[in-house]
Structures are given as C-alpha cells and as structure tokens.
C-alpha cells in the first residue's frame, strides 16, 4: 500500500503512445 506522502508523485513506466507522444519512451503520471 502506497504511503500517503507518495500519492502526489508520478509513477514512471516505459510505454508507447503515452504522455501525448507518438513514439515509445518513458512516461510519468500521477
């Protein structure tokens, strides 16, 4: 279970077509 203080920070993963981009790369989202 995530600690409360971590909830405002993004989690970053590799994906394609994410983060408003057409290619593959790292994408960080809260």
């Amino acid at each position: 279970r995530r600690r409360r203080r971590d909830t405002h920070f993004p989690i970053c993963i590799f994906c394609c077509g994410c983060c408003h981009r057409s290619k593959c790369g790292m994408c960080c989202k809260t």
Epitope: R2, D6, F9, P10, I11, C12, I13, F14, C16, C19, H20, R21, K23, C24, G25, M26, C27, C28, K29
Partner: antibody, heavy 121, light 107 residues
Framework: QVQLVESGGGVVQPGRSLRLSCAAS????????MHWVRQAPGKGLEWVAV????????YYADSVKGRFTISRDNSKNTLYLQMNSLRAEDTAVYYC??????????????WGQGTMVTVSS | CYELTQPPSVSVSPGQTASITCSGD??????ASWYQQKPGQSPILVIY???KRPSGIPERFSGSNSGNTATLTISGTQAMDEADYYC??????????FGGGTKLTVL
C-alpha cells in the same frame, strides 16, 4: 548552479561491498528521476539503474539486478548506489545523472564528474 | 538483448558536415538521445527526443530518427566538436541502451 558530485569510489576486492553517493545541488532534487550510469576503462556507457520520484519506483539493468540497490534521500538531496558482491567486470567510472524534467524524461540532462570503482584482488 | 550500432569512427574536415548513425531494431519507434563526451570529461546531452536541442547546444547540432536508424548531424563542424558521441534509447523500463560510441575526428 546545477551540480552533481559523486563520492565513495575506490579499490575493493571481489565479493565485497561499496556504497556510492551523489550529492545534488542547484535544483529541486525531489522533482527529478535519477540514474546511475557506468563506463569501464576505454569502453562505452552502460546504464545501471534509475530511481524515480517515489522511492519504490526503481529499475535495474540485468547485469546488476540482485546485487546493486539504488536509493535516495530527498531531505539530504542525495542519491545512493549500494553495490554488493562486486565483480571484476563492475570496474568502471560511475556517473550519477539527472533525468529530464517533465512527463517524458527519456534523456539524461545533467551528469556528475564520476567516481572510479576498481574491483581487484 | 537490444543493441544500438554506431560506426567506431567518423572523420570530417573543419566546416564540413559530419553524420553519425545509430542503428537498432525499430529505432524509429522510440526516442533517441545523443551525448557528447570529450576525453576525461563527463557526457553532455546534445540532442533529445530525436530532434530537440537543450539550451546552450549550438544550432549546428541536429538529429533525425526513422526506420531503424537515428542520425546525429553536425553542420559546419568545428575543432571543438571532436569527441566521442553516444546514442541512447529506452527499450523497456529496465532496458536503457547506449550505442557503442563514435569517435569524431576533425581533420
């Protein structure tokens, strides 16, 4: 100015441990992912590990997985690399590098000066 | 295991254009970054997201990426551009790949 300063390198015997540190200044450390990248003498760059904003969001290269641990202390603006079960092939200059800011941090935009780790008996 | 292949060396005359290639499986489907490293120094980011230049990097540095090849182009090459150049791309969350590096010699 924005700066990363590594420390903790040295000569260590195979199988032993070493902890590297990277002191950050000139930017809000907690707002950036941080990497370790190494370079064996006369060789190219090799990515080692990354730790993103949340301490649990971290990834390792297969070559170091299970032996190295990346961590950060945002209150001290410091990045760490705990290296256990060291091997001769771990001999390299170790750089800490900052991930780009933003939603899509593909590149390494700031690099430290590096610290040399030599694994030898 | 993914690999990015660069030519070991490229030579160029001052004022001419240097092109350094970086080839890998479906390279054009991911974002390429390029780094410059001079002897005894740390790497410097010169191109990211295929074509973008960080602030402070001269306009003579440009990049492209399509198919299986990313290319770093240095127009009007200067003596100060002599260095090793590395491409880099992500292939998964746990797989950041650097090319083997290209030594650029300005004749």
């Amino acid at each position: 100015q924005v700066q990363l300063v590594e420390s903790g390198g040295g000569v260590v015997q195979p199988g032993r441990s070493l902890r590297l540190s990277c002191a950050a200044s000139g930017f809000t450390f907690s707002n950036y992912g941080m990497h370790w990248v190494r370079q064996a003498p006369g060789k190219g760059l090799e990515w080692v590990a990354v730790i993103w904003y949340v301490g649990s969001n971290k990834y390792y290269a297969d070559s170091v997985k299970g032996r190295f641990t990346i961590s950060r202390d945002n209150s001290k603006n410091t990045l760490y690399l705990q290296m256990n079960s060291l091997r001769a092939e771990d001999t390299a200059v170790y750089y800490c590098a900052r991930a780009q800011e933003g939603m899509a941090p593909d590149a390494f935009d700031i690099w430290g000066q590096g610290t040399m780790v030599t694994v030898s008996s | 295991c993914y690999e990015l292949t660069q030519p070991p060396s490229v030579s160029v005359s001052p004022g001419q254009t240097a092109s350094i290639t970086c080839s890998g499986d479906k390279m054009g489907e991911r974002y390429a970054s390029w780094y410059q490293q001079k002897p005894g120094q740390s790497p410097i980011l010169v191109i990211y997201q295929d074509t973008k230049r960080p602030s402070g990097i001269p306009e003579r540095f440009s990049g492209s990426n399509s198919g299986n090849t990313a290319t770093l182009t240095i127009s009007g090459t200067q003596a100060m551009d002599e260095a090793d150049y590395y491409c880099q791309a992500w292939y998964s969350s746990t797989n950041v790949v650097f090319g083997g590096g290209t030594k650029l010699t300005v004749l």
